[in-house]
């Protein structure tokens, strides 16, 4: 049985992650985790220098 791609990539979409669709990729820790352990990225106000929240790459299949 051949495996299909883990995620579909659009022209400007992020690179496919090593995670199964059930999980999300933690960009800071560089590994897969349950999506609920990640915070949704929020736009930073201009000039803000606080560290960015943990974010996930998880394109829909």
């Amino acid at each position: 049985m051949r495996r299909g791609p883990r995620s579909l990539r659009g022209r400007d979409a992020p690179a496919p992650t090593p995670c199964v669709p059930a999980e999300c990729f933690d960009l800071l820790a560089r590994h897969c985790v349950a999506c609920g352990l990640l915070r949704t990225p929020r736009p930073k106000p201009a000039g803000a220098s606080s560290p960015a929240p943990r974010t996930a790459l998880q394109p829909q299949e």
Partner: antibody, heavy 118, light 113 residues
Framework: EVKLVESGGGLVQPGGSLRLSCAIS????????MSWVRQPPGKALEWLGF??????????EYNPSVKGRFTISRDNSQSIFYLQMNTLRAEDSATYYC?????????WGQGTTVTVSA | DIVMSQSPSSLAVSVGEKVTMSCKSS????????????LAWYQQKPGQSPKLLIY???TRESGVPDRFTGSGSGTDFTLTISSVKAEDLAVYYC?????????FGGGTKLEIK
Amino acid sequence: EVKLVESGGGLVQPGGSLRLSCAISGFTVTAYYMSWVRQPPGKALEWLGFIRDKANGYTTEYNPSVKGRFTISRDNSQSIFYLQMNTLRAEDSATYYCAQVRRALDYWGQGTTVTVSA
Amino acid sequence: DIVMSQSPSSLAVSVGEKVTMSCKSSQSLLYSSNQNNYLAWYQQKPGQSPKLLIYWASTRESGVPDRFTGSGSGTDFTLTISSVKAEDLAVYYCQQYYTYPYTFGGGTKLEIK
């Protein structure tokens, strides 16, 4: 066709150990997460944990209810993965299922029964 | 841990009837970055292992009849069987995979009159 076959269940005394096996066929073993779930007689399902795939270094996640007593591992050369259960208690009596994780718990084996009793 | 609550615990219906069952989670299962709800539904027929019916709350698994429909978002979810068949006799479980540990509901037992 995806096929998962559990084995290793049986009767064990409280405090004893048991290792369950899940033989895998029909897909590339190293490319999938594999999970264990149990179901006490007449009761609901309980997720025990999973082991990730090769791309993720075969890392594991466990349910805190069994962490430290149960260990999930895999032997990719033989397409088998394991659940090592130590310090077993009466409440560990259940049917134990292995399942392939992708979108959720996609494919399940038929289960193997563990009875913990003196 | 996220607590999953299913209702009713059992129900009896006639063949051809429409059935709805509920699953509620103690916290939202919606990941807003991709708008996915990390909720699955499983069917367990007597003496068999569970089978995945629905994932991401509303996506039907390949091969599952279209009479099975999952809906809902956040904390409230529903599994609907549009026209029950005798072969649908089973226990139906919802499960969250939004965070660890993954947790299941107590199940809804569907009986056929």
